[in-house]
């Protein structure tokens, strides 16, 4: 149920999660000068019954200077495939993002914490991605990306998220929106070129989710 | 139904104006960036022009550059390029265009001739 | 002259299998933009046939698949038909120009 690749890459973007799905893991990493503590918890997991879902495990980092032993704090080679690194992101889930049944908010900082966090995903995972500080996207409404398994494999599907220009940063979904300038910068910009692969167009009802120009024939 | 309709092409001198219009029609235009695309009889497809969502940023081929103004009137929902200073070699149908582009208009043909 | 390089022309049998290239640069597919594929038929305007380097819009036949490596891509058409016929375009978006890019276009001769 592990999500082989990682989401997909953007140029000029970055994405983050709202909420992660059950099963998620996110591996104890600790900031240089810092290790895991001996005998302490490799990764924290996203587990939980059918009303709650919460972060088991608790990751804790200690001075490596204390005492003279091997600093793993990555994964082992044969979980590389699984890993993905992201910019530590402080929590900030929308309310009906974060309350999904079957999915924990983002865990909060732990003291000595790595400035990256790396996750590993499983299916049915969407991550949402916004511009990087100094570009905007050409469409409005949110890119997002969702793990799916298909014939067995797994697979992220494409947000096409197109990046450009000297502009301002962007907000992610369920963030406050800028106030428009006398500049005209646009509402949104976490939107993308022609969106996801599910090419559906935008209709009032859906306005919440991915945006495409095309209609469900093209699904 | 997604359509895209083109209008305001024909026959114009060297150094003329003109104005093309672009009805779109089945989607929510006003949170997709919209582009000009050309080609030249007989030639490729060639990009023109891109403008965003809100119309508040917009970019045009080198060689439209300065003479040719991409705008949109989101309340409309149509799309405008302006074109002025007209050469020969503008002669071309021009594709009103949404998306990737991944949705075109049937086209509407420019021609710049004395 | 087109930012990215197709073979202007390619050609085959019924029932064979024929492969286009588009070939860009670190500017549009090698800063890794999705490629997209278009289909024209004589007089009408291009069509969207592959989306995202390999994605099929529903009702464009599996005959049809896309590939991207680097800075290059390629179209496959296998089971040709006589009805493929057309011109065929790649397109990228370029960070440079700040818009897409077009190959030149390849024309696809059912032989």
């Known amino acids: 149920e592990l999500c082989d690749d990682d989401p997909p890459e953007i140029p000029h973007a970055t994405f983050k999660a709202m909420a992660y799905k059950e099963g998620t893991m996110l591996n104890c990493e600790c900031k240089r000068g810092f290790r895991r503590i001996k005998s302490g918890s490799l990764y924290m997991l996203c587990t939980g019954n059918s009303s709650h879902s919460s972060w088991d495990n608790q990751c804790q980092c200690t001075s490596s200077a204390t005492r003279n032993t091997t600093k793993q704090v990555t994964p082992q080679p044969e979980e590389q495939k699984e890993r993905k690194t992201t910019e530590m992101q402080s929590p900030m889930q929308p309310v009906d993002q974060a309350s999904l049944p079957g999915h924990c908010r983002e865990p909060p900082p732990w003291e000595n914490e790595a400035t990256e966090r790396i996750y590993h995903f499983v299916v049915g995972q969407m991550v949402y991605y916004q511009c990087v500080q100094g570009y905007r996207a050409l469409h409005r409404g949110p890119a997002e990306s969702v793990c799916k398994m298909t014939h067995g494999k797994t697979r992220w599907t494409q947000p096409q998220l197109i990046c450009t220009g000297e502009m301002e940063t962007s907000q992610f979904p369920g963030e406050e929106k800028p106030q428009a300038s006398p500049e005209g910068r646009p509402e949104s910009e976490t939107s993308c070129l022609v969106t996801t692969t599910d090419f559906q167009i935008q209709t009032e009802m859906a306005a919440t989710m991915e945006t495409s120009i095309f209609t469900t024939e093209y699904q | 139904e997604v359509q895209l309709l083109e209008s305001g092409g024909g026959l114009v001198q060297p150094g003329g104006s003109l104005r093309l219009s672009c009805a779109a029609s089945?989607?929510?235009?006003?949170?997709?960036?919209m582009h000009w695309v050309r080609q030249a009889p007989g030639k490729g497809l060639e990009w023109v022009s891109v403008?965003?969502?809100?119309?508040?940023?917009?970019y045009y081929a080198d060689s439209v550059k300065g003479r040719f103004t991409i705008s949109r009137d989101n309340s409309k929902n149509t799309l405008y390029l302006q074109m002025n200073s007209l050469r020969a070699e503008d002669t071309a149908v021009y594709y009103c265009?949404?998306?990737?582009?991944?949705?075109w208009g049937q086209g509407t043909l420019v021609t710049v001739s004395s | 002259q087109s930012v990215l390089t197709q073979p202007p022309s390619a050609s085959g049998t019924p029932g064979q299998r024929v492969t286009i290239s588009c070939t860009g640069s670190?500017?549009?597919?090698?800063?890794?933009?999705?490629v997209h594929w278009y289909q024209q038929l004589p007089g009408t305007a291009p069509k969207l046939l592959i989306y995202s380097n390999n994605e099929r819009p529903s009702g464009v036949p599996d005959r049809f698949s896309g590939s991207k490596s680097g800075t290059s891509a390629s179209l496959a058409i296998s089971g040709l038909r006589s009805e493929d016929e057309a011109d065929y375009y790649c397109a990228a978006w370029d960070m440079s120009l700040n818009g897409p890019v077009f190959g030149g276009g390849t024309k696809l001769t059912v032989l």
């Open positions: 265009a949404a998306g990737v582009p991944d949705y």
């Open positions: 089945g989607f929510t235009f006003s949170s997709y960036g």
């Open positions: 403008i965003s969502y809100d119309g508040s940023y917009k």
């Open positions: 670190s500017s549009n597919i090698g800063a890794g933009y999705d």
